[in-house]
Interface confidence: low
């Protein structure tokens, strides 16, 4: 019968030929009376057989990722009679893996949005690399993820590629971060190959800033002839947040005379000081009122950022008008 062991050939061998093993009949006494033949896909081009000894050689570089096994057929002929010594037999040559493929991130570019001030441990995104090497061959395709850029704000779980927040971030200081993740095969051991990907992480705004008046004192004037409803000036606060988190409402905190009102222009986020009652220079030629400003929308969990509304003082001078 036929005698052989399992045949393996390493991929990417740089030698011109590589001895794989021997295929022989147990009737062969070694006197060169038998002739071995190789048939099938790859015979003669990728593999050859020494027709006298049955030794098989790979004569070209193989790529396991292109083809991982070859099915060939062997024949052994008695040279004297021309008859088959053994029935034709099928055998397999397996291409064994080497770590010749780096991990690749197939879904890049990665982008994620996470709210600013998110607590440590918040999941941001999962990145996944794939490795074309054989997952069943040692650690050639066993990956470990690590962070090359992004400390101290982010961390990556070594085995899953899950990126989490490791330090709170303030959008008002920096609104986006580039994180670079490396995937290393061979679970990081010597000979490992690596691939990297960039993740753009954008911080979305939360209402963690209260509006603050630009000025601590405003000076306005109003003519004593001005009718009620007259706009006598504007005041303005600024809010480092954006969008609806920067929408604000102005109001009177203190006006003993109850002469003025403040309405909010929600397009410009300005406070408009309005005359509520007519003024009389001869009766009172100046007024002092206090205004305050608060955000329009403040979720309960963010109220801690909004204690003590910002206030400003408004001095209003009444202008005299000649009366008949």
């Amino acid at each position: 019968g036929w005698v052989w062991n399992q045949f393996f050939v390493p991929e990417e061998m740089n030698t011109t030929s590589h001895h794989i093993g021997q295929l022989r009949s147990d009737l062969d006494n070694g006197n060169n009376s038998f002739q071995y033949k190789l048939l099938g896909a790859g015979a003669g081009s990728t593999f050859i057989i020494d027709e006298r000894t049955g030794d098989i050689y790979a004569i070209q570089k193989l790529d396991r990722e292109e083809r991982s096994l070859y099915i060939l057929r062997a024949q052994v002929i008695d040279i004297a009679t021309g008859r088959a010594v053994e029935p034709e037999s099928e055998f397999v040559i397996k291409v064994s893996d080497i770590n010749d493929n780096e991990p690749k991130f197939l879904d890049e570019p990665y982008e994620a949005i996470v709210p600013e001030m998110s607590p440590e441990g918040t999941l941001v995104i999962q990145v996944t690399a794939s490795d074309a090497d054989d997952p069943s061959s040692g650690n050639n395709a066993r990956l470990l993820y690590s962070l090359l850029q992004g400390q101290p704000y982010f961390s990556v779980e070594p085995t899953t590629g899950v990126i989490r927040i490791s330090s709170k971030m303030d959008r008002e200081l920096q609104d986006e971060y580039w994180v670079i993740i490396q995937a290393k095969d061979m679970i990081g051991q010597p000979g490992a190959l690596s691939g990297t990907t960039s993740v753009l992480i954008k911080l979305s705004d939360v209402n963690d800033n209260k509006p603050i008046f630009k000025e601590s004192l405003y000076r306005l004037t109003v003519s004593e002839s001005a009718p009620t409803g007259t706009s006598i000036g504007t005041i303005m606060a600024y809010d480092n947040d954006i969008g609806e988190n920067a929408e604000m409402d102005y109001s009177i905190e203190e006006d003993d005379s109850q002469t003025f009102d403040i309405i909010t222009n929600h397009e410009t986020q300005e406070g408009i000081v309005i005359l509520k009652k007519k003024v009389d220079f001869e009766h009172q030629n100046h007024y002092g009122i206090r205004a305050k400003v608060k955000n329009h929308h403040v979720p309960e969990q963010l109220m801690k950022y909004h204690t003590e509304a910002s206030t400003t003082f408004i001095k209003i001078q009444v202008e005299d008008v000649d009366e008949p």
Partner: antibody, heavy 121, light 107 residues
């Protein structure tokens, strides 16, 4: 269409300074690495500096390290090269070049026409 | 640093001929190699990256091959617009380095 337009070149004395700009359009500037590459008269191409998208990582050729500073302004989609302590050997056409995606991140897929820097007394 | 060596320095060929340009790296750079074309007074133009991937708009007559340390740029049938200087460049390691260039001129 991706476009890169360099400016800021000129004649400067040895030891002097210049600031080159590269105005980019047609792509998301902050998502790509950007490069400066120079070419001395009648010579080949020489890489000068690279900045990663977002500006966190910068790299320099040894010949310019400590003298040149690469930077970018994402809000203006503009790349800069601040060149100090200039030498005659810095005389060249300076091109900016956009990086690519993925594995070609630190490559150069689109180039500007260049701006000429002449260092001479 | 990785030294990139291009050969020949000058290649004199006729229209329709095949041009084969070589580029050698002083150590393996995997497939992280690009080829550029430059005409007088113009900016370089990317032809090939990843050693063999054609850039957008590059005709099929231009092809790249090789990996590790030996790379080839082939122009199968030279057209008038192909006469220029060609540079290879590795982007596997810092500093990024270019070859000295090969000038393809009309014979």
């Amino acid at each position: 269409e991706v476009q890169l337009l360099e400016s800021g070149g000129g004649l400067v004395q040895p030891g002097g300074s210049l600031r080159l700009s590269c105005a980019a359009s047609g792509f998301t500037f902050s998502s790509y690495a950007m490069n400066w590459v120079r070419q001395a008269p009648g010579k080949g191409l020489e890489w000068v500096s690279t900045i990663s998208g977002g500006g966190a990582n910068t790299y320099y050729a040894d010949s310019v390290k400590g003298r040149f500073t690469i930077s970018s302004d994402n809000s203006k989609s503009t790349l800069y090269l601040q060149m100090n302590s200039l030498r005659a050997a810095d005389t060249a056409v300076y091109h900016c070049a956009k990086g690519g995606m993925g594995g070609y991140y630190y490559g150069m897929d689109v180039w500007g026409q260049g701006t000429t820097v002449t260092v001479s007394s | 640093e990785i030294v990139m060596t291009q050969s020949p320095v000058t290649l004199s060929l006729s229209l329709g001929e095949r041009a084969t340009l070589s580029c050698r790296a002083s150590q393996s750079i995997s497939s992280n190699l690009a080829w550029f074309q430059q005409k007088p007074g113009q900016a370089p133009r990317l032809l090939i990256y990843g050693a063999f991937t054609r850039a957008t708009g590059i005709p099929a007559r231009v092809s790249g091959s090789g990996s590790g340390t030996e790379f080839t740029l082939t122009i199968s049938s030279l057209q008038s617009e192909d006469f220029a200087v060609y540079y290879c460049q590795q982007y596997n390691y810092w500093p990024l380095t270019f070859g000295g260039g090969t000038k393809v001129e009309i014979k």
